[in-house]
């Protein structure tokens, strides 16, 4: 449905021309170029890459490409004082030490500046004590330990396996349980797929491989020292004691060879059930402490990392719109990596690069998009989404008035099985229509559409004949645009078969083994999945920037609002007596959802019928569509999470990666049976229902006829 009338260009310059210009071979070449050395945030190498991308985007034909720098809090290991964990005997002698590095992959032995595995923003410390195994360190794992097994983690060092939830939530849970240190490790049950060899012979994690990552609990704040405002030259910075989201106990990650050495000696309680057992040849005893012969031995952490205010650089490219230059469609992905970034982020950055090149080619031939397209190469995503958040804070007034959509472009692949899309309901129809026009790259689906293979492999749990599209959570650079500013957002990548591969993420995530060769040998030798992702991401941007009427369908929001209201109501109905006692009613919410549904339906009818040649009416209708997402923003934010302001969606309080619907009500209801003051707790539930109902009703009214 792309239209060219508004930009006065030849029919040749349509979506097809843009898509045909995208080439797998270019993506491959760009990926190779971006992955030969590490590009850790705050380093000279990453600054040089920013300048290279700036230069190349200019060559590709963008109107302007600027660097936007900020001075933010980052974290690095001490080069002369490495981090490690020991087992110490009763005399305090270290009888076992964990590795200081990952063994480098073949061909990279002489690369300098490979940052050793560490947990970014861990405080310094050398705690020693007994070990407690806490499974995935989820909220429910600590409930099991403390409530059912009566195991006290206070004063203990806990060891948790990576997976299921964001590592920052694990650390927060451990802190709340009173732990004095956290060891994170990758269990083969989660990071070693059966029947596949470890790198360099396959895509599995070797025993010496370790996942790096930040352990912050920022809740959308951006730079921990300047929450809400850009970390610019005249910024007022908080003291470190007031910084947002920093962990208070030492944390360190290890691989499964080292984990084996710690876990094989564990004594105390047996694991509560099989879900607490991984795949190592150890008993998975919970502890506390080591078994009989080793009971006098303790675990000691040696953490010497430092937090430093460091300059970071975003690259911001602009392709000015011909008709509505004050409406922005943004395509952004990060550039910084933990080491080589073979998948995260450079498989995404290479796709963005090729999308920019294709748009630039069209522009050089005389074409312009209807709306302005902004391209962003974000810095310091790995340190807490810092580059994107600081830029959005600096430009928030422009973005909230002019932001049409944000498309995220981190890793293009996390597998090679099928498409995975998370987006606002406003984009469902856009994604469906686009994927029906694209060819599937999947074996066995030659000549079939991407929509068909995606629907077959990943069917919607609710609607037959449609593919699964998930809620947006966080853990990536769309967060500030969607959760804080209310700009319609989406993301797409190729993923694994979740039914057969139950490991978390992909096995080599954030390890030194995430190389170009990993992608080229094992994931996508022909780069056909990368090309498909480029077509999806680029196609979405093209359509959002070029279609005369914005490709948003507000009726899809109505459908999910009803689904989410039903879901939260059923959670609440697990407490029928309390609902009666405290007069808790969801009538206002269901009424608001009903009103939204009716108004959205009428708006959609008007959208079919209005005079598209009248620029004022066209702009008015488009603005109603653009501002619908904005209407779900509560300026006061969620309780204790002021930068999560979207009332319909927020990152789960128990897992930053996951999205939660009606998060205010959900959190008020969570574990409500354990609250000491039930009257107060149910009062908060009622307040959150009120906020949600009001917001849905207010959003509905933005779609009403304006006069």
């Amino acid at each position: 449905k792309s239209s060219n009338e508004a930009t006065n260009i030849t029919p040749k310059h349509n979506m097809k021309a843009f898509l045909d210009e995208l080439k797998a071979e270019n993506i491959k070449k760009f990926l190779y170029n971006f992955t030969q050395i590490p590009h850790l945030a705050g380093t000279e190498q990453n600054f040089q890459l920013a300048k290279q991308i700036q230069s190349q985007w200019k060559e590709f034909g963008l109107d302007s490409v600027e660097l936007a720098h900020y001075d933010v809090l980052l974290s690095y290991p001490n080069k002369t004082h490495p981090n490690y964990i020991s087992i110490i005997n009763e005399d305090g002698n270290e009888i076992f030490n964990t590795s200081l590095f990952e063994p480098p992959p073949p061909g990279y032995e002489n690369v300098s500046d490979i940052v050793p595995p560490f947990s970014a923003f861990s405080p310094q410390g050398m705690p020693e004590g007994d070990l407690v195994y806490v499974n995935y360190a989820r909220t429910e794992d600590f409930f099991k330990l403390e409530r059912d097994m009566k195991i006290n983690c206070s004063g203990k060092i806990v060891i948790a396996r990576y997976g299921k939830v964001f590592r920052g939530n694990k650390v927060k849970n451990a802190q709340l349980a009173g732990a004095k240190g956290v060891i994170l490790y990758s269990d083969p049950a989660d990071y070693f797929a059966p029947g596949v060899k470890s790198y360099p012979d396959g895509w599995n994690l070797p025993g010496g491989g370790v996942q790096r990552g930040n352990i912050l609990n920022l809740n959308g704040a951006g730079d921990p020292l300047t929450p809400g405002y850009p970390a610019n030259e005249y910024a007022y910075r908080r003291g470190i004691a007031e910084a947002v989201g920093l962990p208070s106990i030492p944390v360190h990650p290890i691989g499964y060879y080292d984990a084996q050495k710690l876990l094989e000696k564990m004594g105390g309680s047996a694991p509560p059930d099989s879900s607490w057992r991984g795949s190592l040849k150890v008993p998975y005893n919970v502890g506390p402490g080591f078994t009989g012969n080793f009971s006098t031995q303790k675990v000691k952490m040696h953490i010497h990392s430092t937090n430093e205010v460091t300059r970071i650089y975003n690259v911001i490219g602009t392709l000015r719109g011909a008709v509505e230059p004050d409406r922005y469609v943004i395509l952004g992905g990060h550039r910084d990596s933990w080491v080589f970034g073979g998948i995260d982020p450079q498989s995404g950055a290479a796709v963005v690069h090729e999308i920019v090149r294709s748009f630039g080619t069209l522009k050089k031939e005389g074409w312009r998009p209807r709306r302005t397209i902004l391209f962003a190469s974000w810095d310091a995503e790995e340190f807490g989404l810092l580059g994107s958040t600081e830029w959005a804070e600096e430009n928030s007034r422009l973005l909230q008035e002019r932001g049409v959509a944000y498309i995220n472009a981190d890793s293009s692949i996390e597998g090679n099985y099928t498409l995975r899309v998370d987006c606002t309901p406003l984009m469902y129809s856009l994604v469906h229509n686009l994927t029906k026009e694209l060819k599937s790259p999947d074996e066995g689906f030659e000549g079939k559409s991407l929509y068909e293979s995606w629907t077959k492999k990943s069917p919607s749990p609710e609607f037959s004949g449609m593919p699964r599209i998930s809620k947006l959570g966080s853990g990536n650079d769309f967060e500030v645009f969607f959760q804080r500013l209310g700009i319609a957002s989406g993301r797409a990548r190729y993923t694994k078969n979740w039914e057969t591969n139950k490991f978390s993420g992909y096995p080599l995530y954030h390890s030194v083994y995430e190389t170009y060769e990993l992608v080229e040998k094992f994931y996508d030798p022909m780069f056909k999945y990368h090309l498909t992702v480029a077509q999806v991401r680029g196609g979405m941007v093209f359509e959002l920037a070029n279609s005369i009427v914005l490709p948003f369908d507000c009726r899809d929001y109505a459908v999910v609002l009803r689904k989410y209201a039903d879901k939260i109501y059923s959670i609440s109905m697990k407490h029928p007596q309390e609902m009666k006692t405290y007069s808790v009613s969801f009538d206002s919410l269901f009424s608001a959802v009903k009103n939204f549904t009716e108004i959205a339906s009428k708006f959609s009818e008007r959208l079919q019928d209005f005079d598209k040649s009248n620029p004022i009416v066209l702009r008015m209708m488009n603005d109603q569509l653009m501002f619908l997402e904005r209407a779900f923003i509560d300026p006061l934010g969620l309780p204790d999470r002021p930068f999560y302001r979207h009332v319909i969606y927020a990152p789960s309080s128990h897992n930053k990666y996951a999205g939660e619907s009606f998060p205010g009500i959900y959190d008020a209801l969570f574990d409500i049976e354990s609250k000491v003051d039930p009257s107060k707790a149910w009062g908060e539930v009622k307040r959150q229902i009120y906020v949600a109902a009001f917001t849905v009703q207010a959003a509905a009214e933005t779609l009403s006829e304006v006069a």
Partner: antibody
Framework: EVQLVESGGGLVQPGGSLRLSCAAS????????MAWVRQAPGKGLEWVAN????????YYLDSLKSRFTISRDNAKNSLYLQMNSLRAEDTAVYYC?????????????WGQGTTVTVSS | EIVLTQSPDFQSVTPKEKVTITCSAS?????MYWYQQKPDQSPKPWIY???NLASGVPSRFSGSGSGTDFTLTINSLEAEDAATYYC?????????FGQGTKLEIK
């Protein structure tokens, strides 16, 4: 019990060939990289070659690459070293070793060795 | 290739004495590995990843170091420790061993 037993050593003339074998038992052979390490009389240890799990990747000491071939048969739990164009300086005890770390060469289990003598 | 140089080549030591063997690498490596070999026996893994004792190795042994300089220490020598000790790097191919340090009991 984890065990590696080498065989096939002996006396051979310069320019001749020999095939060493190593029989593995007590562990899942296909789960490990394997290696050959040699020791000349009265001298130190010298790594010869490594082979990956399924034999698709091999790594050699550069000076031996054109003459020696490492291979494996996982169905038979066996490792081999084919040595061609042998020279006097190839005289050594040849050890078969299991590589615990895969690719990287930390040898946690060694055979008892088999002696190769190259002499006319 | 990374050349490993051990020092000393030979040492004659009295029981209960502290012994230090060093291994110097021609360029930086991630870890050092040590093996013990007694006459007419196969080498045995002794210390892995610089500082960790292999199974069955007495606690009087320890390993340390980083970068290019690594050390194997015996804090109180016993007669059974008489052997040749080899360091080995696995940072890059070709895998290389030191020339060995022979410990003799006086």
């Amino acid at each position: 019990e984890v065990q590696l037993v080498e065989s096939g050593g002996g006396l051979v003339q310069p320019g001749g060939s020999l095939r060493l074998s190593c029989a593995a038992s007590g562990f899942t052979f296909s789960d490990y990289y394997m290696a050959w390490v040699r020791q000349a009389p009265g001298k130190g240890l010298e790594w010869v070659a490594n082979i990956n799990y399924d034999g698709s990747s091999t790594y050699y000491l550069d000076s031996l690459k054109s003459r020696f071939t490492i291979s494996r048969d996982n169905a038979k739990n066996s490792l081999y070293l084919q040595m061609n164009s042998l020279r006097a300086e190839d005289t050594a005890v040849y050890y078969c070793a299991r590589d615990l770390d895969g690719y990287y060469g930390y040898f946690d289990v060694w055979g008892q060795g088999t002696t190769v003598t190259v002499s006319s | 290739e990374i050349v490993l140089t051990q020092s000393p080549d030979f040492q004659s030591v009295t029981p209960k004495e502290k012994v230090t063997i060093t291994c110097s690498a021609s360029s930086s490596v991630s870890y050092m590995y040590w093996y013990q070999q007694k006459p007419d026996q196969s080498p045995k893994p002794w210390i892995y990843r610089t500082s960790n004792l292999a199974s069955g190795v007495p606690s009087r042994f320890s390993g340390s170091g980083s970068g290019t300089d690594f050390t194997l220490t015996i804090n109180s020598l016993e007669a059974e420790d008489a052997a040749t000790y080899y360091c080995q790097q696995y940072h890059s191919y070709p895998l290389t061993f030191g020339q060995g340090t022979k410990l003799e009991i006086k």
